[in-house]
């Protein structure tokens, strides 16, 4: 008499079972076990049972153990039930947008999954159950039909499986789609709103307003504004069922002349939009020319302004003469004029309204090095074991390096603390350097000697 | 802006040896000169500096053994009784801190002294 | 004594990598501080002066720290043409030193 331990089991696709093959008989002839599955024999004590190790089991299977005892051979089957989840559950596509009132139909396909006898598929919106059936066919398919709603807008539809193996000791396994999301729409028939300014001066900006009542949802409305083939980046304020989108627009040279300003609103696959004119009229900032704008000190520099033809400017102030659009002064370039400032002010005539344009440029001067007095003494005197801080500040532009030398090798250390010492007499000659020049100073250390009394 | 040694070569020991550099595009009377030598497959080692005045000034361990001094173009190094470890590379070298890092290499090439019997 | 202490003696380094070498006076030398490079039969180029500033013609991977006693040279993304011998100098005493440079460090580039 031949057994099998266990007769029946159900495990994951690819696990493994201990399966024990015995005999009643004491000295078996022959015992073991029939089956296509991986097998490692595990060692035990007699011979009138043996115990395998069954592994990576893709299907179910019927493992069959055997024995040949003096009284004749016999077998036994263990079933061996293999389950696995779903390889794909999918919801088909749904169109974006549906108006209320449509029949919408879901289909729902399940590919794999068993054992199948345990797998069904439910179709959901939301939480909501709206259809469950078992799995049938492969790949499976469960479809069902909604009649679309206004509070269906935003509403989630999924797929689920469910394998069921609970009155086996198992669990639940469940799988879910990804899910389709349904939109609803309304849209009334009357077109926007649209209010902006009927003139647009290049290169400043201004506001376009668009809004619209009777909308659902109005928070999905998508509103573009253009002006001519540019497009706006509003921001949009919501009402219930309405909306106002306002927009800063500029505007180029390029846009000069008559454009169209157009807005539309687009809800699910329809629109509405509405069209206006606005006249964009062209006023550059005035032109500040320098001849170079870094020259060396004593250059000559030239400074011109620019600006329409229809404009008249002032420069620095100064109008020019005669009065109209350009205007020139003539320096020549000193170290107080690095970083200095040349203005030019534009005034233009449009429609009866005066514009104003300004434009700024700065001189840059090279000059120096500088050594003097005031920033670089040419007489220091302290004490001796005084702590002091040499000071020698040269001035240029570009700011020049600076070197201090006693007897052409000994540094004496600018700008930093010292302890005077004997060391520290003497003449030093500092040198300031820069791509404009070199100059030197010189400067002399004393050292006082403290008095005993 | 250059400047070049001369006068190396084989000298035997406790003889006497004078290394001249000569200069050229700056005055002897703005900027230091420096003598610095390095033996054969080791360090620079600073033997001593001539100041624009005319000072000199000396390391350590070169006061006596070495004498440093100039005319208006050329510097001098006088080597007293010298060993076999005065062999080495002698360069001639502007002083460092009249630099301004534009690419100041005042260095000679350096003139080989050895010192043998 | 104005003298120099040179850390390490040798180091080696693989292309890309990066090298620290450092430098300490016996006593303060503020700013006073140059790096020279010196390739095998070669007279010693210039790197840094003032302990940070870079000579003209000097690649920014040669980096110069550190003032008064402690001085650091850093050569970052190295390249096989940095292999020399790397010396410090004190620039600030002419008198009272026994030696203005230091030891020296020898760069192998793998």
């Known amino acids: 008499q031949t057994s099998v331990s266990p007769s029946k089991v159900i495990l994951p696709r690819g696990g493994s079972v201990l399966v024990t093959c015995s005999t009643s008989c004491d000295q078996p002839k022959l015992l073991g076990i029939e089956t296509p599955l991986p097998k490692k024999e595990l060692l035990l004590p007699g011979n009138n049972r043996k115990v395998y190790e069954l592994s990576n089991v893709q299907e179910d299977s019927q493992p069959m153990c055997y024995s040949n005892c003096p009284d004749g051979q016999s077998t036994a089957k263990t079933f061996l039930t293999v389950y696995w989840t779903p390889e794909r559950v999918e919801l088909a596509p749904l169109p974006s947008w549906q108006p209320v009132g449509k029949n919408l139909t879901l289909r729902c396909q399940v590919e794999g999954g068993a054992p199948r006898a345990n797998l069904t598929v439910v179709l959901l919106r939301g939480e909501k159950e709206l259809k469950r059936e078992p799995a049938v066919g492969e790949p499976a398919e469960v479809t069902t039909t909604v009649l679309v709603r206004r509070d269906h807008h935003g509403a989630n539809f999924s797929c689920r499986t469910e394998l069921d193996l609970r009155p086996q000791g198992l669990e639940l396994f469940e799988n879910t789609s990804a899910p389709y999301q349904l939109q609803t729409f309304v849209l009334p028939a009357t077109p926007p709103q649209l209010v902006s300014p009927r003139v647009l001066e290049v290169d400043t900006q201004g506001t376009v307003v668009c809004s619209l009542d009777g909308l659902f949802p109005v928070s999905e409305a998508q509103v573009h504004l253009a002006l001519g083939d540019q497009r706006l980046n509003p921001t949009v304020t919501y009402g219930n069922d309405s909306f106002s989108a306002k927009a800063s627009v500029s505007v180029t040279a390029e846009d000069e002349g008559t454009q169209r300003l157009t807005c539309a609103v687009i809800l699910g696959n329809q629109s509405q939009e509405t069209l206006q004119t606005v006249t964009i009229y062209s006023f550059p900032a005035p032109n500040v020319i320098l001849t170079k704008p870094e020259v060396s000190e004593g250059t000559e520099v030239t400074v011109k302004c620019e600006a329409h033809p229809r404009a008249k400017v002032t420069l620095n102030g100064v109008p020019a003469q005669p009065l109209g659009p350009r205007a020139q002064l003539l320096l020549k370039a000193t170290p107080e004029d690095n970083g200095r400032s040349f203005s030019c002010s534009a005034t233009l005539e449009v429609a009866g309204q005066l514009i104003h344009k300004n434009q700024t440029r700065e001189l840059r001067v090279l000059y120096g090095p500088r050594l003097d007095e005031r920033d670089c003494p040419g007489n220091w005197t302290w004490p001796e074991n005084s702590q002091q801080t040499p000071m020698c500040q040269a001035w240029g532009n570009p700011l020049p390096e600076l070197k201090c030398l006693k007897d052409g090798t000994f540094p004496l250390p600018i700008g930093e603390s010292v302890t005077v010492t004997r060391d520290l007499e003497g003449t030093y000659l500092c040198r300031a350097r820069s791509t404009q020049g070199e100059v030197t100073r010189k400067v002399t250390v004393n050292v006082l000697s403290p008095r005993y009394e | 802006q250059s400047v070049e040694e001369s006068g190396g070569g084989l000298v035997k020991p406790g003889g006497t040896l004078t290394l001249t550099c000569t200069v050229s595009g700056f005055s002897l009377s703005s900027y230091a000169m420096g003598w610095v030598r390095q033996a054969p497959g080791k360090g620079l080692e600073y033997i001593g500096i001539?100041?624009?005045?005319?000072s000199t000034y000396y390391a350590s361990w070169a006061k006596g053994r070495f004498t440093i001094s100039k005319t208006s173009t050329t510097v001098d190094l006088k080597i007293t009784s010298p060993t076999t470890e005065d062999t080495a590379t002698y360069f001639c070298?502007?002083?460092?801190?009249?630099?301004f890092g534009d690419g100041y290499r005042l260095w000679g090439p350096g003139t080989l002294v050895t010192v043998s019997s | 004594a104005y003298d120099m202490t040179q850390t390490p003696a040798s180091v080696e380094v693989a292309v890309g990598g990066t090298v620290t070498i450092k430098c300490q006076a016996s006593e303060n030398i503020y700013r006073y501080l140059l790096w020279y490079q010196q390739k095998l039969g070669q007279r010693p180029s210039l790197l840094i002066y003032?302990?940070?500033k870079l000579a003209s013609g000097v690649p920014s991977r040669f980096k110069g720290s550190g003032s008064g006693t402690e001085f650091t040279l850093t050569i970052s993304g190295v390249q096989s043409d940095d292999a020399a011998t790397y010396y410090c100098?004190?620039?600030?005493?002419?008198?009272?030193?026994?030696?203005?440079f230091g030891g020296g460090t020898e760069v192998v580039v793998k």
């Open positions: 100098q004190q620039a600030y005493s002419s008198s009272n030193v026994d030696n203005a």
């Open positions: 001539i100041g624009s005045s005319g």
């Open positions: 070298v502007r002083d460092p801190y009249d630099s």
């Open positions: 003032d302990a940070s």
